[in-house]
Amino acid sequence: GITIPRNPGCPNSEDKNFPRTVMVNLNIHNRNTNTNPKRSSDYYNRSTSPWNLHRNEDPERYPSVIWEAKCRHLGCINADGNVDYHMNSVPIQQEILVLRREPPHCPNSFRLEKILVSVGCTCVTPIVHHVA
Amino acid sequence: GITIPRNPGCPNSEDKNFPRTVMVNLNIHNRNTNTNPKRSSDYYNRSTSPWNLHRNEDPERYPSVIWEAKCRHLGCINADGNVDYHMNSVPIQQEILVLRREPPHCPNSFRLEKILVSVGCTCVTPIVHHVA
């Protein structure tokens, strides 16, 4: 990996062992200033593999609300607006990092957690398996 | 929101004001035990709106490596395997949280940062705008 020279102004950390505890400032910096969220907001409806968004809430997690995509159909929407079962709508999944309160119900102590979320759906050619 | 009773065994936190600093254990807990990653790994190639994955590396960020999807075509792949420009391939984007080293180059001090990543692509019906 890349070795980074340590900044002499870094805060001290007592525990140098893994699992290591670090300090995190929760005042979120948003890098998404030049994006237009309106543009992609209706893709879930206009896609040939449309999806619904379901709210997943967990007060022990940060962020507490995550939206999960569920494909509306097994097939994909064709040019006539009908479901075509020769193709399949499948969820596009991504692993994301969240903070889990640990110990539970603590406002200032967390553990990093990796979760898999479905972000949207795409239309794919199914793989054919010949079974006995 | 939901009020959670505070666990009496929580670590003390000096600063009760925002921006608040919390302790985070970086020993990641992986919740994705019952998923089959093989199933979705080739969707980028089999989709009617295929995409390429580009590696984005930043040693000042945690995770340092993030994969960004870029749609291969403006149009979508039709049943004959040709690009159909009546439809459009568009990226599905998601806001994710990452940790940004702050001050820079510090191994144990971070700030939460929100970034927008393209996870994959989907095929949509373009909106027609009539302009003068």
Epitope: C71, L74, Y85, N88, S89, V90, P91, V124, P126, I127, V128, H129, V131 | R39, S40, Y43, R46
Partner: nanobody, 116 residues
Framework: QVQLVQSGGGLVQTGGSLRLSCSVS????????MGWYRQVPGRQRELVAM????????YYADSVKDRFTISRINANNTIHLQMNNLKPEDTAIYYC?????????MGQGTQVTVSS
């Protein structure tokens, strides 16, 4: 691992009827479907009929609408294809299929021959 067992088929006169059956076992998700494809040698595989595992939604190819009926017995994941008013052009190998999102599992196939 998905397993499919299909039965039925055979030789029938034009205008006659046949019933195909198929049962599936293994990993079945709520967003899946079962049905039949058919294939004539040298021609492309055709989706004949399909039924959604949980919703019960059905799909029929235009060529078989009002003649074929697909039904499902939920308890043991068995489907039936009732084929009435059969025509010579229905002659083909019929494959039972189980469709999970992104994956299509096909059975061993059964011959249906309609003689004129």
């Amino acid at each position: 691992q998905v397993q499919l067992v299909q039965s039925g088929g055979g030789l029938v006169q034009t205008g006659g009827s046949l019933r195909l059956s198929c049962s599936v076992s293994g990993d079945i998700s709520s967003q899946s479907a079962m049905g039949w494809y058919r294939q004539v040698p040298g021609r492309q595989r055709e989706l004949v009929a399909m039924i959604h595992t949980t919703k019960g939604d059905t799909y029929y190819a235009d060529s078989v609408k009002d003649r074929f009926t697909i039904s499902r017995i939920n308890a043991n994941n068995t489907i039936h294809l009732q084929m009435n008013n059969l025509k010579p052009e229905d002659t083909a190998i019929y494959y039972c299929t189980h469709n999970e999102p992104g994956d299509l599992y096909m059975g061993q196939g059964t011959q249906v021959t309609v003689s004129s």
